[in-house]
Interface confidence: low
């Protein structure tokens, strides 16, 4: 049996749950810390194209799998036309960014807005112009763009022609799309994210059917999709590393999402094993090949040998180290609905600090960007979102403790989200924006919520002052 404790993979994270003080890096007595974040801490905010852009077939945009899924699977949702209409109201988004005073804006490019059928030929001019204008405006404001290439809106044509991410043909097609984006936008983009939360793409897209394309119950498909997502990411990283990094001098990663979990019985070793299994089966599934030893976690290989694809030795070498930092998502999409298989009969927890400690121990203390964090409110809540403030304070406090007390190398934080918008399987029943948008209004004004004022103050003070 291969024991990899020295290199920091596969199992070290179990120490998080141990109540033996020699084992656990998190001191639970440190409840709140009045302190500042590191001097050049990177404060930002994010959106996903499908969630906020609207205009799903305007100006030559092709349909995505989510546009199709909305029409076929989600009841009482006509289309994302009812969203915040960022495609039309770009200036209003920029004013919202100005109001908060962020250092960066994380947004995603809609693949079918650039290439309506997914194949890289001549780009849709209006789509190209939209993203180019946005980037120019950000640069002008000294706001760093962090650009996600794929936030779930696969061109429908690729799903229908190839079966989407189930088909490894898509790896090269995705790489072509990435190459185009690097060529057109790389002069203004220093931070790239290939794929947003591939776990949810695979698990809910092909396992539960709760996400597009809505396929259900085929475990082999779930892990094939995961496999192709990892290989696509790796290919794009090598592409960027070889052909674009030398002159564009940027960084590239993949956003990996996870829940956190606590043992039913804190002194029970087997419950702790189950918690480890839970984290490994969600976060480790993608993190181990990319941030670890280049392969799936040992436990997954053993338990899922009949459905989990195999990486060849050459592929392991190729996968390993294909991220310039650890981009981590911690938000409601990984908690509700939680994969009960991943829950392992244990208790889910919103302890971001412990999740960060787990990453530190498992993956050799990487530099971490919190690439998505926040909670949600009911759609009836307008601008007085006190729950969101409470959650944000809690999460930010945990990040600060992780940095100051646990020496975890978090360099940036992405509040989620800039705007109220389309929230996937929850459609418009919840809100996650720091700015309120009345979806039924014509002008879609962005009204700062209490959380926007709160986040603005945090950024201004670079943390929590007494």
């Amino acid at each position: 049996i291969l024991l990899r404790a020295v290199t920091g993979f596969s199992g070290d994270g179990r120490a998080i749950w141990s109540k033996n003080p020699n084992f656990t890096p998190v001191n639970e007595s440190q409840l709140f810390l009045y302190d500042t974040f590191p001097k050049n801490f990177f404060w930002g905010i994010g959106t996903g194209a499908l969630q906020v852009e609207g205009s799903w077939k305007k100006d030559g945009k092709g349909p995505s799998i989510w546009d199709h899924f909305i029409h076929t699977h989600l009841k009482n949702v006509s289309s994302t036309n009812g969203s915040s209409d960022s495609y039309i109201f770009l200036e209003k988004d920029l004013s919202a960014l100005d109001f908060i005073g962020v250092s960066f804006y994380q947004f995603s490019i809609s693949w079918p807005r650039l290439f309506p059928d997914g194949i890289v030929t001549v780009a849709n001019a209006k789509g190209l112009q939209y993203y180019s204008t946005l980037l120019d405006a950000l640069v002008l404001r000294n706001i760093e763009p962090i650009v996600t290439l794929y936030h779930w809106d696969l061109p429908l044509a690729l799903q229908e022609k190839y079966g989407g991410w189930k088909n490894d043909t898509i790896i090269d097609i995705f790489n072509d799309y990435a190459t185009y984006c690097f060529q057109m936008f790389g002069d203004r983009v220093k931070y790239w994210i290939t794929i947003h939360n591939p776990y949810l793409v695979a698990w809910h897209g092909y396992g539960t059917g709760m996400h597009a394309p809505g396929e259900k119950g085929n475990l082999a498909a779930v892990y094939t999709v995961g496999h192709n997502l990892i290989k696509a990411h790796s290919k794009v990283w090598h592409n960027y590393n070889t052909h674009f990094r030398p002159h564009q001098k940027g960084w590239l990663s993949i956003t990996l999402g996870s829940h956190w979990i606590e043992p039913n019985r804190s002194e029970n070793t087997m419950d702790i094993f189950k918690c480890q299994q839970s984290m490994v089966s969600v976060l480790g599934w993608f993190a181990n090949p990319i941030h670890g030893d280049g392969d799936y976690p040992e436990g997954m290989r053993k338990k899922l040998f009949s459905v989990l694809p195999i990486f060849s030795e050459a592929e392991k070498h190729e996968m390993r180290g294909t991220a310039d930092f650890f981009a981590f998502s911690f938000g409601p999409n990984n908690f509700k609905p939680l994969n009960t298989m991943a829950k392992m009969g244990q208790n889910v927890s919103l302890n971001l600090r412990e999740a960060l400690n787990w990453i530190k121990l498992e993956y050799n203390n990487p530099r971490i960007l919190i690439a998505e964090n926040g909670w949600f409110t009911d759609s009836r809540v307008k601008t007085e979102d006190t729950t969101a403030i409470y959650m944000m304070k809690n999460f930010l406090s945990q990040v600060l403790q992780a940095i100051r007390l646990d020496e975890i190398r978090v360099f940036g934080y992405t509040a989620w989200s800039l705007l109220d918008g389309f929230e996937w399987q929850d459609a418009y029943t919840i809100r996650r924006g720091l700015f309120y948008v009345d979806f039924n209004s014509k002008q879609k004004e962005r009204k700062p919520k209490s959380s926007a004022h709160y986040y603005k103050q945090i950024i201004r003070e670079n943390g929590f002052s007494l």
């Epitope: 049996i1 024991l3 404790a5 596969s10 199992g11 070290d12 994270g13 179990r14 120490a15 141990s18 033996n20 084992f23 002194e267 029970n268 070793t269 087997m270 419950d271 702790i272 094993f273 189950k274 918690c275 480890q276 299994q277 490994v280 976690p297 040992e298 436990g299 997954m300 290989r301 053993k302 338990k303």
Partner: antibody
Framework: QVTLKESGPVLVKPTETLTLTCTVS??????????VSWIRQPPGKALEWLAH???????SYSTSLKSRLTISKDTSKSQVVLIMTNMDPVDTATYYC????????????????WGQGTTVTVSS | SYVLTQPPSVSVAPGQTARITCGGN??????VHWYQQKPGQAPVLVVY???DRPSGIPERFSGSNSGNTATLTISRVEAGDEADYYC???????????FGGGTKLTVL
């Protein structure tokens, strides 16, 4: 090479306390993926698990014998000790210690290396 | 607590396939380990985690586990395979190791 060796008295009297020592080599009792179990086997009968100790010092005992058993480890000596009180002739058996392995950080993967066993007879 | 049930004995001719079962409530959701014990010797792990073989164990030994039954299969049985075989699980609810009652394999 991983080895475990049991040692202790060959003969104990009824009501006495049995102390068995398992000395390990080739691995550390501090290794987060290792644990040690004690198992016994009365003559001509099946294996019966007695107790287990994990690297973080967590212990687990057979329900039927819990009140009579204590397991502990001395990492510096690479030893695991089992104490069994109030011995009875029905406790006559071969006592084994075995290494338990956890792979992938969370799977209990059985007992991959066993000692050769020590035979204990309880008789007055 | 969790109970594992094994047949007391199984007989098979040399060269044939022996199948030793281990029954338990929803055992398919547990990891099952199998041990071989020859007379006067300590047990030896022959299959772990349902179907994995430790190094040095011949490929003739294989395992499967689903529903309420786990099975140890020994193909092309040899005289040297004659031994007692025990199945074992870790019962996560009680945090206990549980052994089956053992099966005596006789090679005819």
């Amino acid at each position: 090479q991983v080895t475990l060796k049991e040692s202790g008295p060959v003969l104990v009297k009824p009501t006495e306390t049995l102390t068995l020592t398992c000395t390990v080599s080739g691995f550390s009792l501090n290794n987060a993926r290792m644990g040690v179990s004690w198992i016994r086997q009365p003559p001509g009968k099946a294996l019966e698990w007695l107790a287990h100790i994990f690297s973080n010092d967590e212990k687990s005992y057979s329900t039927s014998l819990k009140s009579r058993l204590t397991i502990s480890k001395d990492t510096s000596k690479s030893q695991v000790v089992l104490i069994m009180t109030n011995m009875d002739p029905v406790d006559t058996a071969t006592y084994y210690c075995a290494r338990s392995v956890v792979t992938g950080g969370y799977y209990y993967d059985g007992m991959d290396v066993w000692g050769q066993g020590t035979t204990v007879t309880v008789s007055s | 607590s969790y109970v594992l049930t094994q047949p007391p004995s199984v007989s098979v001719a040399p060269g044939q396939t022996a199948r030793i079962t281990c029954g338990g409530n929803n055992i398919g959701s547990e990891s099952v380990h199998w041990y071989q014990q020859k007379p006067g010797q300590a047990p030896v792990l022959v299959v772990y985690d349902d179907s994995d073989r430790p190094s040095g164990i011949p490929e003739r030994f294989s395992g499967s586990n689903s529903g309420n039954t786990a099975t140890l299969t020994i193909s092309r049985v040899e005289a040297g395979d004659e031994a007692d075989y025990y199945c074992q699980v870790w019962d996560g609810n009680s945090d206990h190791v549980v052994f089956g009652g053992g099966t005596k394999l006789t090679v005819l």
